[in-house]
Each structure stands twice: as C-alpha cells, then as structure tokens.
C-alpha cells in the first residue's frame, strides 16, 4: 500500500488532514499528548479504519473502546474506505487518560480523496484502475512482471512532414495517438477540494528530454490534445474540478534505450496543499507510474518475410526479375528503389536494418538507418519511414565510420537457449576485429552501445575484419529448419569446397571449368584450383578465421555441430591480406521462408549440372528449402557483394512478447 503523510494531532485545536484512499497514514498521537496522561483510546467515523500496533513484536488490533498505553512503541495508522462527500466529513477522536486528570480530547477531521494515476501496468493493452493492488513504481521483467510500456513515436503519420512524430509538440490525429500509451488520472474529491489543493504532474529533469505527455480533453477531437510535459516542461499544474473526474494523458517516448538512458521513465502526480497563502505549498501525496521504453528488436531469417527491398541499377534487370519471382513465391510485397534515388548505391542490406518496437496495444516496424550514408542515404528516411513505420539512427552522420558500420555486418540469430539461459528473441551478431590495432576496424561504439542497451537480444561480437568488406553476412546465414532448434546456421567453408573439388577430380573431372559461360572472365580448371599453392594457403587462413567464429557461435548460441551446415566456398586474399569470395559467395543468400535466393556460383559443370549448386541443394533441400540460384556476377559479385548485400527484408515480429523475457 502506498505511503501517506504523517499526521500530528494536538488537543489544543482540531487538526484537519487529507487522506488518500489506498494509502497508509501514520498518526502521531504522542508528541503533543498532555504531560500527565499515560493511555489513550480512539474512536473513528465508519469510513475510517484505524490500526494500532504495540510492538515489537507488532500486535495489530482494530479500534474499539480499548485503551492503549501512551508510549513511543505504539504505532497508529489510518486508512480510508471511501472518498468524502464534503471536506472533513470523517472524524477521529483521540481521548487521553491520566491517573489524576479528566480525559483530554483531540479531534482530527479527515477528508478522504481518491487520486490515482493508472497505466497499463498489467500489459494487457488496456488501462485498468490498480489502486492499492500493485506497486506501479517498479518495473519488472518476465511473464509475472509488471510495468507500463512506452513506444518511441518514431514514425511519420503526417506524410507532408519530413520529421518523426516525436519531433513535434502536436498530436496529428488518432493514428498518432495510437502510437502513444494511455495514462489516466482518476480523482474523487469534495466539490471545493481544489480551492485549497493542487495537483502537479511531473517528470525528473534527467528524463524530461526522453518523454512527452499530452493531455486529452475528454470527448473532444484528438487535435485538442495539448503538451503538458516534455523536453521544455518537467512539470505541469493540472486544472482539476472537484467531484468525480477522469483525465486522460497520452505518453510518447522520445528516445530509445541507450548507454546513457536505461529506458525507464517515471511520471509522478503530486498533491499539494495550497491552503496557506503565506507558506509554500506542501506535498500531501505522490503517486507514480514507471514506464519502460520498448526496445528496438531485430528479426532473424526464421521469421516470415513480409516485404523485400532491392535497388534498380544499370543492367540489373535480370537480377530484379529473379528477386521478384522469389518474392512472389514467398507472398511478399516488393519495393524497388529506382536508380535516380539510389545514386548507383545498390547495397540495400548495408544501408538499413528493419526491426520493430512493441507495446501491448501496438506494434510498429522500425528501420534502423546505418551511418554509412552513401547513395541510399535518403532511402530509409524518405521511402521507408512513414505512417506506422518508424525510424532510428545512431553513429556519426559525417565521417568517422568504417565498413563495419554497414548493416551487412549486423545480423541476429533465431531464438536460442545457451546453458539454460533463454534468448527467446535470439542474439544480435556483428563483426569486429580480433584485437584493436592502428588500422583494425570495428563497429562504431555508438552503434554497439545502442544495440547492447536494447537488452533483449544480447549482442555477440564475431571476428570479421579479416574480410575485405568485413561483414558477417559474408560467412554466415541462418535458414529455417523443421527439426532440432528450428534453424540451421550456414557457414562458408573452404574445406568443404576443396573436398568437393577433390572428389570431382578423383572422378576424372579435373578439366571442368569454374566460371564457364561468363564472358570476359578467365576460367579456372578444377585441377588448377587444387594445385594452386597460394590459393590453398589463403583458404587455410580463411578457414581458421571462420573456425574461430564457428566455436564462438557454438558457445554463444548453444549450438552443436549438427546445427551447422558447411556451404562450399573459396576465398582469395587481396590487398592487405583481406579476403574476398573467389566465386559468388553462396552463403550471402536471401532467405524468404523456405525460398532461398542464392548467388549463382558458376561452378564446374559436371554431367550437365553445376557441382556447387548440386552440393548446396543436397544440403538444404532435405530441410524443405527451395534453392533458386540468382546470377549476380557482374552486377553484384565483382563489386564485392552478393544477393543478401543487395536486398533487405521486413519480417513478421515475434509472437513472443519482449517484456515476458528476463534479460
């Protein structure tokens, strides 16, 4: 039960006090008691419950005509059952007794009021009155947890605006309101109560730039909402009429959890006594609601796809046809960024990552815009963000970034359990160097901090700086599977490729050509690839790098070898010993449910079929997956990327609610 104020009674004159329903009010009967009195008794109106405890140990007893010893060990507390119809309509009489004196009486006139700030602390999507039931001042995780949730109002419901909804002080319409969380102030007081009392709604100064609160005028249009708390206003005096009254507030978060903001926001209502104009206002009561800002959540390849994004560039019509066919098979919407908007930047995966935010009453896709800021710089803001599609970005917007800040270097695993610890939303994966050096690359600290601060998909740092481009999607992918953990981790594997080529040579196919049918591309015989000592050394190094990640992933995702599939792939080391795919990198695939868009490797054709394609199909088709090999050679591969790099996917949010997990 909430703590009320301390009331001191004195026999000299009647005491007037306010008692808020649902609070426990301490009664000080000792400090002003007549000197020669040794005991007391209490009588109260029917609407007041008095508890007397004499301890230690505390033995509680409700009031009757009994007398109690007047000593400091006696605790007297009051609670009110009903709100008062008029000021001071509930009375408490304390009688003091002494051996030689007649009884001395002290009178206390109580006004019972109902004041409660309610939000959806039970996470049902509805605001229910919770007076005296739960402590709203704490926020707890897990299925039995409690605490309200806020969304960052980061979409753009007004198509004529270039800004996010949370960047203005206005409520556009009911659509805008739906992105906010409802908070209700319920009051029940005597009619004249607010002539001597005031309610003030406030937020800590340290949190005022993270939240905005709008006050709604009941029964009026949403446009009548006016801002009462926010970056410029930490407190607001409320004009509340006496009697029974409900006041609605709509709350939007302005910032995502981050390194300097744990995501918790406390809104407090304070009841102030303003009856004495000569003195400062005195706090009578406070009620608070704690909100947690919903984290930005990534979706893994195992989540059903809803929309595919790709770029139109010079001569990639065939690539787009293949992606279109795949999207249709997977029943996905397809969005193509035209040439005039992408400015010859085809790397859709690198520019953005589409996740979502969720509250019990609303789920919103949110695009995380990378700070790479090349030709596609404007695409997430101008074409993705919109009504019910949010936007967030982090990191320096001009310079100071590396290739590891592109979001081909940002992936997320499917849900996993690791040594008994559950990650029901998976774990974020991003690439890094294995140790810092003068020229090593790492994901910008601002991005790392943001990802960690979301709490619900604890990040794992992998080693990707050995690659020329340096992205984790160059050596790993996840595909759905009907058994085991519900997915398989795919890893690029030089060892597997050499084994396959050796088998083909042993069967007399050493003359078969890699890159056959590609104009202006030097073809390579299986036997020459196998005999090239330098290429073998390079791939031995690459294998070690991938194996390092393999062990890391097994440990951090709780995987067994049987959860991993090796995809045959060769690499070559280029300048500064950085690796690039030797032929189109098949692990860099587009996963749309059971439909996979895999870079066409142009491997040696044996008995009329590419042996690399055949091998990959034999590994993935038993899982119910359908492999489509897409020719991305001249439009993507030779520009250091593949199918996954050139596409992006919005996926269905998890059915699991993030607040039900325990980070």
């Amino acid at each position: 039960m909430a703590q009320g104020t301390l009331i001191r009674v004195t026999p000299e004159q009647p005491t007037h006090a306010v008692c808020v329903l649902g609070t426990l009010t301490q009664l000080d009967i000792c400090s002003s008691a007549p000197e020669d009195c040794t005991s007391f008794s209490i009588n109260a109106s029917p609407g007041v419950v008095v508890d007397i405890a004499h301890g230690p140990p505390a033995k509680k007893k409700s009031t009757g005509s009994s007398t109690w010893p007047l000593d400091p060990g006696v605790e007297v507390t009051l609670t009110m059952k009903v709100a008062s119809g008029s000021t001071g309509d509930q009375k408490v009489q304390i009688s003091y007794y002494g051996p030689k004196t007649p009884p001395v009486k002290a009178l206390l006139y109580l006004t019972g009021v109902e004041i409660s700030l309610c939000a959806d602390i039970t996470r049902t999507g509805k605001v229910k009155p919770t007076r005296a039931v739960k402590d709203q001042r704490t926020w707890t995780w897990g299925p039995c947890g409690q605490g309200a949730i806020l969304l960052v109002n980061c979409d753009r419901d007004n198509l004529e605006s270039s800004a996010m909804d949370c960047e203005d002080d206005e409520v556009l319409d009911s659509e805008d309101l739906q992105d906010m969380s409802l908070m209700t102030l319920s009051t029940k007081t005597p009619k004249d109560f607010f002539t001597n009392h005031t309610l003030v709604l406030h937020v800590a100064r340290s949190e005022m730039d993270k939240v905005r609160v709008f006050q709604a005028t009941r029964g009026k249009l949403s446009s009548k909402c006016s801002v009462v708390l926010g970056p410029k206003w930490p407190s607001h005096y409320l004009m509340v009429p006496g009697g029974k009254h409900n006041m609605d507030f709509y709350v939007e978060a302005l910032a995502f959890p981050d390194t300097d903001f744990p995501g918790l926001i406390t809104l407090t209502i304070s009841l102030l006594d303003t009856s004495n104009l000569e003195l400062p206002e005195a706090v009578v009561f406070q009620d608070s609601v704690v909100f947690r800002v919903a984290p930005w959540i990534m979706t893994p390849n195992t989540q059903p796809p809803q929309e595919v994004y790709a770029c139109s560039i010079f001569e990639n019509e065939d690539f787009l046809k293949s992606v279109t066919t795949l999207a249709m098979k997977a029943k996905c919407k397809l969005t193509i960024c035209p040439e005039e908007e992408n400015m010859d930047d085809q790397w859709m995966q690198d520019e953005m990552e589409i996740g979502y935010i969720q509250a019990p009453h609303k789920t919103l896709p949110v695009v995380f815009d990378s700070p790479r800021n090349r030709g596609l710089k404007e695409f997430p803001i101008k074409r993705v963000m919109g009504p019910d599609f949010g936007y967030v970005t982090r990191g320096p917007q001009t310079g100071g970034i590396s290739g590891l800040d592109s979001f081909g270097n940002l992936e997320v695993s499917p849900p996993v359990t690791v040594r008994g610890k559950e990650y029901p939303l998976g774990r974020i994966l991003f690439g890094d160097s294995c140790y810092p050096s003068n020229d090593s690359r790492q994901m910008h600290q601002a991005l790392q901090d943001f990802l960690s601060a979301q709490q619900v998909q604890a990040p794992v740092k992998l080693y990707s700086d050995w690659l020329s481009v340096g992205h984790v999607d160059e050596f790993l992918s996840f595909v759905p599977a009907p058994d085991r953990k519900g997915f398989r981790l795919l890893l690029a594997s030089p060892r597997s490729c050499y084994k396959l080529f050796q088998e083909q040579q042993n069967e007399g196919h050493g003359e078969a050509l890699l890159f056959e049918g590609i104009k202006k591309k030097k073809q390579q015989k299986i036997k020459n690839i196998l005999s090239n000592k330098t290429l073998r050394e390079h791939n031995s190094f690459v294998e070690r790098c991938i194996d390092w990640n393999r062990e890391l992933l097994k440990r951090e995702l709780g995987l067994a070898e049987s959860d991993i599939i090796d995809i045959p792939q060769l690499f070559k080391l280029k300048e500064f010993s950085k690796a690039e795919a030797f032929f189109p990198n098949m692990v860099n695939m587009l996963v749309l449910g059971k439909h996979l868009g895999i870079p066409k490797p142009f491997g040696p054709v044996i008995n009329g079929r590419c042996c690399l394609e055949e091998k990959v199909c034999s590994l993935l088709e038993p899982l119910g997956l359908q492999c489509t090999f897409i020719n991305d050679f001249f439009t993507y591969h030779i520009r250091h990327g593949e199918v996954h790099c050139g596409t992006n996917v919005r996926r269905k949010p998890f059915s699991f609610k993030w607040w039900n997990m325990v980070p």
Epitope: R374, S402, G403, D439, G470, L573, K574, E575, S577, H640
Partner: antibody
C-alpha cells in the same frame, strides 16, 4: 586508362585543415585502389594513405594517422584526403595514385601496394 | 631516414648497365613479393616501371628488370640511355604499422 587530377592544395597555417580532391576521368574510379603519396621539397616519396576499391577499408602512415582521413565518393568518381592539425613537416606535393582492382587474378597480385597511374600533384604549404 | 635503404646516387655511361639496390628487412622486402620501382624526372610525377619484384607494366622497355634476394631488391637498367637519367625509388609492402614503405631514392646520372 584512368587519368587523375589533384586539387585543393594551398597555403595553410599550422594547426589548420585542408581537403584534397582527386578526380578521375577516362574510367570508373570504383574499380581502382587509390593511394595518396607525398614528396617534401627536395626529398623522397612518402606513402600517406590507401583506400580499397570497395570503399570498405583504409590504411594510414604512422606520421598522419589520426590527423588525416581518406574517403571516396564513387558516384562523383573522386577520392579525398581530409588533412587536419597540419604541421610544417606536412609541407609537400601530394600525389593521388591508383591501381586497377583486377578481379580476374586467381590470387592477390599486390595491386594495392603499387601505383601505376599518378596525378600531377598538388602543393600543400604549411607555414605561419 | 627512410625505411628502405638505397644508394644516394649511381652513374653509368650510355649503353652500360647499372644496378640500384634496395635493402629492407625480413618484415618487408624479405617477406613479400610486393616490391615496385618508380622513375621520376625532375618536376614530374613518378612513373611505375616494375611491380611485384620483376613484372613490367606495358610500355616499359625490357631494358628495365627487377629481382630480389633475401632482404634486398634490385633494379637493373641495361643499355643505358640519356632519358634514363632520373630519380629511382623502390617501394615494398610491409608488416609494420605503415604498410607501404619507400626508399630514399637514388639519383641516376648518365655520363
């Protein structure tokens, strides 16, 4: 064959900044590794910085690391060298040079370590 | 003080051969086959004449040849001609924190 033209040099006070540009013509610069090399008056060549064709990694000489930043804008067919906290010893002719990133080689040909096309250079003078 | 050591000057008569040495360490010249040579005439930009120790770009006469032994690379110019008079610089990839090193340069005088 690509041709390179440097610009942006000039006189600057110690502690000041300059941004050098290297504009390419005759070919697409996105197919090329690019390095900046400098030559102090009457002295030898000194390698300064490198950016790969894919625009995914960069390297610097110890003498400029933390002060200079190399970048490229393939849409503009240009590479840049942002020079901050300039010192008197940075006075030199700055050359932009490039080498084709030949994807046909079976293994690394070392093209990032040599410069087969050079611009004419731009003079940077750091003096108070 | 340059990282790779070259003689300050060499000279030869027309038609003769000259060799310019470039000495590094086991962390650069000795480790990698990424040694290149540049020719620079006064007031002009350098020009690549040898790369990957001994390979010649198209258009460079075969009078220019390169080799390497241990930590030392060499540039040999046979059948010297007057237009060969210039400064010559060697360069190598290095595993040090500055990944490309140059020699101090050698002035070739054709007598």
């Amino acid at each position: 064959q690509v041709q390179l033209v440097e610009s942006g040099g000039g006189l600057v006070k110690p502690g000041g900044s300059l941004r050098l540009s290297c504009a390419a013509s005759g070919s697409t610069l996105s197919d090329y590794f690019v390095s900046w090399i400098r030559q102090a008056p009457g002295k030898g060549l000194e390698w300064v910085s490198f950016i790969n064709a894919a625009n995914t990694f960069t390297y610097y000489a110890d003498s400029v690391r933390g002060r200079f930043t190399i970048s490229r804008d393939n849409a503009k067919n240009s590479v840049y060298l942002q020079m901050n906290s300039l010192r008197a010893e940075d006075t030199a002719v700055y050359y932009c040079s490039s080498a084709n990133d030949d994807v046909d080689d079976i293994v690394a040909p070392g093209r990032g370590y040599y410069m087969d096309v050079w611009g004419r250079g731009t003079l940077v003078t750091v003096s108070s | 003080q340059s990282a790779l050591t070259q003689p300050r000057s060499v000279s030869g008569s027309p038609g003769q051969s000259v060799t310019i040495s470039c000495t590094g360490t086991s962390g650069d010249v000795g480790r990698y086959s990424h040694v290149s040579w540049y020719q620079q005439h006064p007031g002009k930009a350098p020009k690549l004449i040898i790369y990957n120790v001994y390979e010649r770009p198209s258009g460079v006469p075969d009078r220019f040849s390169g080799s390497k032994s241990g930590n030392t690379a060499s540039l040999t110019i046979s059948g010297l001609q007057a237009e060969d008079e210039a400064d010559y610089y060697c360069s190598s990839h290095s595993r040090s924190s500055t990944p490309v090193l140059f020699g101090g340069g050698t002035k070739l005088t054709v007598l």
